[in-house]
Interface confidence: medium
């Protein structure tokens, strides 16, 4: 079931163009920006999604692009280079020949340099910590109910195997979701934790990437879980290489 056959759309990625020109007249979908064919039975890679987002008409973007000096997370908004599998290329460069190395989720992990900068390999992000703060509720959520529902969310909506949801921590109003996935653990067909985290981040912001689905309605025992702040931390298998001046 690569794409919805009846009206030829991509259930898992609305930033696609679909037509019945696949083998045997099957619906085939291509990501905006890159034109790469996508598997609509699973999540599209973050790299292709970012590329599609940057190719969308300017007035379709809901967020202002912050300056490069901003200290807040700028939502990873840049036009990335993706490899033939849709993964981030280890080295990314902008139009002014400024280059930097990224990890598997496309986050910069070195100082910026010029075209001579070498990025030998794409370093895997093996641990993602999603830090949420929920809106005030009458009482705290039951921790085990919250844990179960968030695991279900990642399994059902993002198709991430439960073994990759390492832990769910809760100290009202803060929720932390730990995703862990080493290179050796990730089998063919497994959703990448970086892609799942990106879909989740967009869902939480009310910018669902799914075709035609309503926004994320997350409930714990019927009680709405409304998130008012999200921070995502990425840990790589090899520590990042930043110069000391960045740390001062």
């Amino acid at each position: 079931h690569t794409a919805a056959q009846d009206n030829c759309t991509c259930p898992t990625n609305k930033m696609t163009v679909c037509s019945p020109d696949g083998p045997g007249g099957r619906c085939q979908c291509r990501a905006l920006g890159s034109g790469m064919a996508v598997d609509c039975s699973t999540l599209t890679s973050k790299c292709l999604l970012l590329k599609a987002r940057m190719s969308a008409p300017k007035n379709a973007r809901t967020l202002v692009r912050p300056s490069e000096h901003a200290l807040v997370d700028n939502d990873g908004l840049y036009d990335p280079d993706c490899d033939p599998e849709g993964r981030f290329k280890a080295r990314q460069c902008n139009q002014t020949s400024v280059c930097w190395c990224v990890n598997s989720v496309g986050v910069r992990r070195t100082d910026k340099g010029d075209l001579s900068l070498r990025c030998d390999e794409l370093v895997r992000t093996h641990h993602i910590l999603i830090d949420l703060r929920h809106r005030p509720t009458a009482g705290a959520f039951n921790h085990s109910d919250l844990d179960a529902e968030l695991r279900r969310l990642f399994r059902e909506r993002y198709r991430l195997h439960p073994k990759f949801v390492a832990a769910v921590h809760y100290e009202q109003p803060t929720i932390q979701i730990e995703l862990r996935q080493n290179t050796s653990q990730k089998a063919a067909g497994d959703v990448d934790i970086g892609d799942a985290a990106y879909y989740f981040e967009r869902d939480i912001k009310g910018e669902s990437l799914f075709q035609g689905r309503g926004g994320l309605d997350l409930r714990v025992r019927g009680e709405p879980l409304q998130v008012e702040r999200t921070l995502i931390y990425y840990l790589d298998e090899i520590p990042p290489k930043f110069s000391m001046k960045r740390l001062t």
């Epitope: 039975s41 179960a148 279900r152 059902e156 439960p162 073994k163 067909g189 689905r213 409930r219």
Partner: antibody, heavy 120, light 110 residues
Framework: QEQLKESGGGLVQPGGSLTLSCKAS????????VSWVRQAPGKGLEWIGY????????YYATWVNGRFTISSHNAQNTLYLQLNTLTAADTATYFC?????????????WGPGTLVTVSS | DVVMTQTPASVEVAVGGTVTIKCQAS??????LAWYQQKPGQPPRLLIY???KLASGVSSRFSGGGYGTDFTLTISGVECADAATYYC????????????FGGGGEVVVK
């Protein structure tokens, strides 16, 4: 008491269509996954597909090839299996079965089944 | 595509005896395996989940074991009521799956 009850089975001509219903009672089926499973007379269990209503997720067995469609009406606690282009090989008892609400897919609640006979 | 293979297809056992049914997965499914009992004219009933955990209301005469690719269901102190067909079911994944159930194993009680 938690229950599932299938309905809509019967005799249908080859090439015809049929929609089966599965009514849930005693629990909010939005937050459980439900599978459709069939069993031809004297044969084993054959999984057809799955829906998780709260997140609109559906999966299908590879052999389904778009012939069958699973959907849900969340407010009515009912899910559906639409069967198209039926052949004699689709003659079977069709069960709906709910998963346990944990993070794996074992099926701990089954309906009694509804028989579909495809014959001219 | 994970394929489940059950053996034997049929087995005879005397009342009070012990019987073992085997199930093999074509690839590693960790402990994501369930066993069901089905009697004629009835829907299946969950017996065991996560390879070895007993479902609610199931007799302790039933036990499950195994991990990875090889699993067993053992019935000890067999009773006439245990005559049924038993199915294994990989509960790991439903993506790109032909059939997560094994072919079934019939237990005939003498």
């Amino acid at each position: 008491q938690e229950q599932l009850k299938e309905s809509g089975g019967g005799l249908v001509q080859p090439g015809g269509s049929l929609t089966l219903s599965c009514k849930a009672s005693g629990f909010d089926f939005n937050y459980y996954g439900v599978s459709w499973v069939r069993q031809a007379p004297g044969k084993g269990l054959e999984w057809i597909g799955y829906i998780y209503p709260a997140y609109h997720n559906t999966y299908y067995a590879t052999w389904v090839n778009g012939r069958f469609t699973i959907s849900s009406h969340n407010a009515q606690n009912t899910l559906y299996l639409q069967l198209n282009t039926l052949t004699a090989a689709d003659t079977a008892t069709y069960f709906c079965a709910r998963d346990a609400g944990s993070t794996d897919y074992n099926l701990n609640l089954w309906g009694p089944g509804t028989l579909v006979t495809v014959s001219s | 595509d994970v394929v489940m293979t059950q053996t034997p297809a049929s087995v005879e056992v005397a009342v009070g005896g012990t019987v073992t049914i085997k199930c093999q997965a074509s690839e590693d499914i960790e402990s994501y395996l369930a066993w069901y009992q089905q009697k004629p004219g009835q829907p299946p009933r969950l017996l065991i989940y996560e390879a070895s955990k007993l479902a609610s209301g199931v007799s302790s005469r039933f036990s499950g074991g195994g991990y990875g690719t090889d699993f067993t269901l053992t019935i000890s102190g067999v009773e006439c009521a245990d005559a049924a067909t038993y199915y294994c079911h990989q509960a790991l994944t439903i993506g790109n799956v032909d059939n997560p159930f094994g072919g079934g194993g019939e237990v005939v009680v003498k």
